[in-house]
């Protein structure tokens, strides 16, 4: 018995179905086929879970969280024992193993391993201004999404005037910040933060209004 090489890693957007491949060759009939799918969750590597089981011509549910979401892609028994997972969740991310036995065919590689990563687009980021908006001050524009896998990167842009950040601006795409030093009237305007990762983007807006000093009456 020989389980074929798997693609190694599969990525899927949260909520979408995933197919985890596992095929094998055997010299024996499929009368005594036994297939166990296990997962080692990324969130709990010390606690492997059973996903689905085929034994004695019957299918059995694995861990409760997979109930109603998991099944074999084809009619069993077969040499293609790939499974699907519907409505993928973040907690489905992990390393999946198919263990195949088909007596009396013993020996060879009877395990296939496939990694599953469930991706999450950035949630709507939160935009805020840190610091005084008085002319001549330094301000920081902050942007962060609570959700996003892979971790989002952040790009600040200006949506009015010359369509670019002031030359005194320094951008950090990882932290989601823009520091604008020595703000002037030209720094005023509409700023947009774009949070993006491999599967999506999300935006938020900030209206920066630089405050000019009020003339004081000397009496």
């Amino acid at each position: 018995l020989e389980v074929s090489e798997s693609p190694g890693s599969i990525q899927v957007a949260r909520g979408q179905p995933a197919v985890l491949p596992c095929t094998f060759t055997t010299s024996a009939a499929l009368i005594n086929l036994n297939v166990i799918w296990m997962v080692t969750p990324l969130s709990n590597a010390n606690q492997p879970e059973q996903v689905i089981l085929y034994q004695g011509g019957q299918m059995f549910d694995g861990a409760p969280r997979f109930h109603g979401r998991v099944g074999f892609t084809g009619t069993m028994p077969a040499t293609n024992v790939s499974i699907f997972i519907n409505n993928t969740q973040l907690s489905d991310t992990g390393t999946y193993q198919c263990l195949v036995n088909n007596l009396p065919d013993i020996g060879g590689r009877n395990i296939g391993v496939t990694g599953l990563t469930v991706l999450v687009p950035p949630s709507a980021p939160h935009c805020q201004i840190q610091g005084s908006q008085d002319i001549g001050s330094d301000v920081i524009l902050l942007c962060s999404s609570e959700e996003g896998i892979p971790r989002p990167t952040y790009l600040w842009e200006k949506l009015d005037n010359t369509l670019k950040l002031p030359p005194t601006a320094t951008q950090d795409q990882v932290q989601g910040t823009v520091t604008i030093r020595n703000i002037s009237a030209l720094s005023s305007g509409l700023y947009q933060c774009v949070a993006s990762n491999a599967i999506g983007t999300s935006t938020c807006l900030l209206d920066l209004q630089v405050i000019s000093p009020q003339p004081r009456n000397i009496g």
């Epitope: 949506l159 009015d160 010359t162 369509l163 002031p166 030359p167 947009q192």
Partner: antibody, heavy 121, light 110 residues
């Protein structure tokens, strides 16, 4: 090497469409606002359209508004100009240009070599 | 016609000084920065001056810029044969959300 390279120009009939591309290399593409500028044969420079670093903001010259669309793909470091309902007066060399991050005002510090668009029947 | 007015042509002898004007209004030059470009025959334009009077690295100090009210001026001293080119000013109008070039000035070195 820091450069911009336009492509997609050619001969097109009046009323037709064309999409120009501008491939950038050697700098952090998404940090820069970009523009398309054109020059009709024997004439001066004419600004056509501009787009912000993330693509969220864009401006157009009155002469192309409603017919041309500027866009960018930051994952491919590429700027585009979709030109529809082309007219004979759109015949020109089209340049893409980068707006300097060192300037408060508009200042195109990097230009492509240009691509020729000819609108003729 | 461009909303920024430049003289169609200027000329001067080598070693001399020349100025090129760019005239606009309060909606463009009057409230915004100006940049200047040199275009040699058959080539793409090149940035000479930005933010009214700043020179990018590599631009010789023979080139200078200034702005007063609704007009901007490019100055070139110690004229050289290789300065023969077309020169353009550029600014933007906040209200119209457009960038605008001047009509261009052809500089001839006699």
């Amino acid at each position: 090497e820091v450069q911009l390279l336009e492509s997609g120009g050619g001969l097109v009939q009046p009323g037709g469409s064309l999409r120009l591309s501008c491939a950038a290399s050697g700098f952090t593409f998404s940090f820069y606002s970009l523009s398309w500028v054109r020059q009709a044969p024997g004439k001066g420079l004419e600004w056509v359209s501009a787009i912000s670093g993330g693509g969220g903001g864009s401006y157009y010259a009155d002469s192309v508004k409603g017919r041309f669309t500027i866009s960018r793909d930051n994952s491919k470091n590429t700027l585009y100009l979709q030109m529809n309902s082309l007219r004979a007066e759109d015949t020109a060399v089209y340049y893409c240009a980068r707006d300097s991050r060192d300037a408060y005002g508009v200042a195109f510090d990097l230009w492509g070599q240009g691509t020729m668009v000819t609108v003729s029947s | 016609a461009s909303v920024l007015t430049q003289p169609p042509s200027v000329s001067a002898a080598p070693g001399q000084k020349v100025t090129i004007s760019c005239s606009g209004s309060s909606s463009n030059i009057g409230n915004n920065y100006v940049s200047w470009y040199q275009q040699l025959p058959g080539t793409a334009p090149k940035l000479l001056i930005y933010d009214n009077n700043k020179r990018p690295s590599g631009i010789p100090d023979r080139f200078s810029g200034s702005k007063s009210g609704t007009s901007a001026t490019l100055g070139i001293t110690g004229l050289q044969a290789e300065d023969e080119a077309d020169y353009y000013c550029l600014t933007w109008t906040g209200a119209g959300r457009i960038f605008v070039f001047g009509g261009g000035t052809k500089l001839t070195v006699l």
